[in-house]
């Protein structure tokens, strides 16, 4: 296993609709054809997997159908979007990149993007 540098923004504020997007960029030392991207969430010293996708270079990222993540790739950059976020989901979201094929296997883990989420103000009841 060889180390690889992964860069991501330090902080992002999610939209009022609970959507946060950020770019995860990795310094690919070779010509990888198969890449796996995993988003981890660290909160209160616990790390949980948010979503993961494996893609072939030049193809779209495919997350599971029920995943809260979507993404696109361009060269050594992955543009990740996480949706359905609520205030309780505020935390550090870490991008993990693995170059699966061809060998050698490379692993890179970013410093994390702190995502802040604000629950929208409830709309006042309106009488018609």
């Amino acid at each position: 296993c060889k180390a690889m540098h992964v860069a991501q923004p330090a902080v992002v504020l999610a939209s009022s609709r609970g959507i946060a997007s950020f770019v995860c960029e990795y310094a690919s030392p070779g010509k990888a054809t198969e890449v796996r991207v995993t988003v981890l969430r660290q909160a209160d010293s616990q790390v949980t997997e948010v979503c993961a996708a494996t893609y072939m270079m030049g193809n779209e990222l495919t997350f599971l159908d029920d995943s809260i993540c979507t993404g696109t790739s361009s060269g050594n950059q992955v543009n990740l979007t996480i949706q359905g976020l609520r205030a309780m989901d505020t935390g550090l979201y870490i991008c993990k990149v693995e170059l699966m094929y061809p060998p050698p296997y490379y692993l890179g883990i970013g410093n994390g993007t702190q995502i802040y989420v604000i629950d929208p103000e409830p709309c006042p009841d309106s009488d018609f």
Partner: antibody, heavy 116, light 108 residues
């Protein structure tokens, strides 16, 4: 090294607006947020809100909602805070700071005096 | 919103003495998101401690932070003349960011 340099002192009349600038250097501007904090004479620190420079999203303190606007110009790595409908109790030193999380670096402060 | 309460409001001590400042949060705060700042008259606040216990760059070892959950402490092991100032705790675990009301450490 990281530096935040703010615009100079302002004197405004009640009802007017003020726009304070904060020029950042020494780091990748878009990777971090900019918070604005104010301090009335002899008082503590009051967080006004912040802008996520990466995407331009903002979050303001509830008591200032509707009166404050925070923006950035990424081409010049400058953040701006505009406060409208000024009142005498808006007289304070206004600081910009890099963050959250953690306000690691602070500007030198801008004194805004509201007086008729 | 998370309310941060600092005590005491004023601490009167002599140089060389130990200062213990308290900060209490109205709800649990992950220690990664608790900071302490020092402010001297006419100056901007300066970060002392972040992550509840990590000293910022250039901060002397006499400053230490501890605590978790809702109770946090800033300790100055031996007060130097330049340490007499106002100290603020602040959380950015949740929005809005909130500061404590401050503790003034004054010369006795």
């Amino acid at each position: 090294q990281v530096q935040l340099v703010q615009s100079g002192a302002e004197v405004k009349k009640p009802g007017a607006s003020v726009k304070v600038s904060c020029k950042a250097s020494g780091y990748t501007f878009t990777n971090y947020g900019i918070s604005w904090v104010r301090q009335a004479p002899g008082q503590g620190l009051e967080w006004m809100g912040w802008i996520s420079v990466y995407n331009g999203n903002t979050n303001y303190a509830q008591k200032l909602q509707g009166r404050v606007t925070m923006t950035t110009d990424t081409s010049t790595s400058t953040a701006y805070m505009e406060l409208r409908s000024l009142r005498s109790d808006d007289t304070a030193v206004y600081y910009c700071a890099r963050g959250p999380p953690t306000l690691h670096y602070w500007g030198q402060g801008t004194l805004v005096t509201v007086s008729s | 919103e998370i309310v941060m309460t600092q005590s005491p409001a004023t601490l009167s001590l002599s140089p060389g003495e130990r200062a213990t400042l308290s900060c209490r949060a109205s709800q649990s705060v992950s220690s990664n998101y608790l900071s302490w700042y020092q402010q001297k008259p006419g100056q901007a606040p300066r970060l002392l401690i972040y992550g509840a216990s990590t000293r910022a760059t250039g901060i002397p070892a006499r400053f230490s932070g501890s605590g978790s959950g809702t109770d946090f402490t800033l300790t100055i092991s031996s007060l130097q003349p330049e340490d007499f100032a106002v100290y603020y705790c602040q959380q950015d675990y949740n929005l809005p960011l909130t500061f404590g009301g401050g503790t003034k450490v004054e010369i006795k």
